[in-house]
Interface confidence: low
Amino acid sequence: VEETLMDSTTATAELGWMVHPPSGWEEVSGYDENMNTIRTYQVCNVFESSQNNWLRTKFIRRRGAHRIHVEMKFSVRDCSSIPSVPGSCKETFNLYYYEADFDSATKTFPNWMENPWVKVDTIAADESFSQVDLGGRVMKINTEVRSFGPVSRSGFYLAFQDYGGCMSLIAVRVFYRKCPRIIQNGAIFQETLSGAESTSLVAARGSCIANAEEVDVPIK
């Protein structure tokens, strides 16, 4: 099962994430694919050169998780559909994370750059949209999931770097995976979190329920 650590769509007020510089990402009310009102972040400085716009989440506690998954819903404007757009227009953005033992971030720390931030991946849209028609909803919503780990400190921040695109970050959900507590074949298996790597197998030792007796050695 998936255990959510943070879901931007549940925000009832402003998300209040940190942006750098102020002329970059902007928090606005938007809509999800079901036309529900949600808080989103948008940036569209395609006609300005040398863009390097960062957006940082609030501190996310890892709650014992070793591997973190990030689901992003976003839309990207098709660069070629913007008249006279410069060649620096982008249809991608970067995802980063930074581990910390407590909520220590400020306007200037961690530095807004790769290292100390750890790059997870460059995120590209499967579908970009060419016309903005909020009435007809031409905008295409993409969903991408990325994971990273192992994480070992109390928590982490995520950052989204735009370097010259026209995009809307519609929803961010951060979660980890675990096997729930189950009773099977007379044994109780406690809740077990997934391993640090995507392919990790974690052995879960069961214990007998009341009036049950172990008759065989568990398979290793």
């Epitope: 070629s80 559909s81 006279s84 060419s130």
Partner: antibody
Framework: QVQLQQSGAELAKPGASVKMSCKAS????????MHWVKQRPGQGLEWIGF???????TDYNQKFKDKATLTVKSSNTAYMQLSRLTSEDSAVYYC?????????????WGQGTTLTVSA | DIVMTQSPSSLSVSAGEKVTMNCKSS????????????LAWYQQKPGQPPKLLIY???TRESGVPDRFTGSGSGTDFTLTISSVQAEDLAVYYC?????????FGAGTKVEIK
């Protein structure tokens, strides 16, 4: 394999209009933008404009804005209509596809449609 | 519009010789975001449509012989044929793929002696 099959040669009178086609096969038509390029006899190449087949969005070289009209049909075919023809429009016209993000170039071209404008 | 200037306009070489042609753009074709140069080279043989040789200034298109090499950055670019063959008789065009309207150079015609 990828193919862009263009319609045959056209002979037209000054002032008339012509519509040429470019049928795509061997790839997902809506994943690439279709561009059109003009080449006059013994001359270089001139970019006319493009159409995004998934949305119908077009953008033109200002020089051809009142000359060319680009459209697409769901049958994997792109069209270019040239209006108010003059002898200056006599040329070979190529359709060519272009994918953004991976390659910044036009990787496959049609064989060309020759247009002759003559009274 | 970005103006692409190619030189020389033509050259005549013997099979096996090295050929170098230049392309200069009136504005930089370097994308600072991804450090890619949005420049392509095409080969056009008589009676045929252009064929993509090089994109991103230096990346050889699949199936293109390795005797063709693209180099350069910003505003100055070069296409080199290390050992020209008879089948390389063609006009070579560079293209600005950075800004609309896309523009092409006037071409360099390569003739084989």
């Amino acid at each position: 394999q990828v193919q862009l099959q263009q319609s045959g040669a056209e002979l037209a009178k000054p002032g008339a209009s012509v519509k040429m086609s470019c049928k795509a096969s061997g790839y997902t038509f809506t994943s690439y933008w279709m561009h059109w390029v003009k080449q006059r006899p013994g001359q270089g190449l001139e970019w006319i404009g493009f159409i995004n087949p998934s949305t119908g969005y077009t953008d033109y070289n200002q020089k051809f804005k009142d000359k060319a009209t680009l459209t697409v049909k769901s049958s994997n075919t792109a069209y270019m209509q040239l209006s108010r023809l003059t002898s200056e429009d006599s040329a070979v016209y190529y359709c060519t596809r272009r994918l953004k993000l991976l390659r910044y170039a036009m990787d496959y071209w049609g064989q060309g449609t020759t247009l002759t404008v003559s009274a | 519009d970005i103006v692409m200037t190619q030189s020389p306009s033509s050259l005549s070489v013997s099979a096996g010789e090295k050929v170098t042609m230049n392309c200069k753009s009136s504005q930089s074709l370097l994308n600072s975001g991804n450090q890619e140069n949005y420049l392509a080279w095409y080969q056009q043989k008589p009676g045929q449509p252009p064929k993509l040789l090089i994109y991103g200034a230096s990346t050889r298109e699949s199936g293109v012989p390795d005797r063709f090499t693209g180099s350069g950055s910003g505003t100055d670019f070069t296409l080199t044929i290390s050992s020209v063959q008879a089948e390389d008789l063609a006009v070579y065009y560079c293209q600005n793929d950075h800004s609309y309207p896309f523009t092409f150079g006037a071409g360099t015609k390569v003739e084989i002696k």
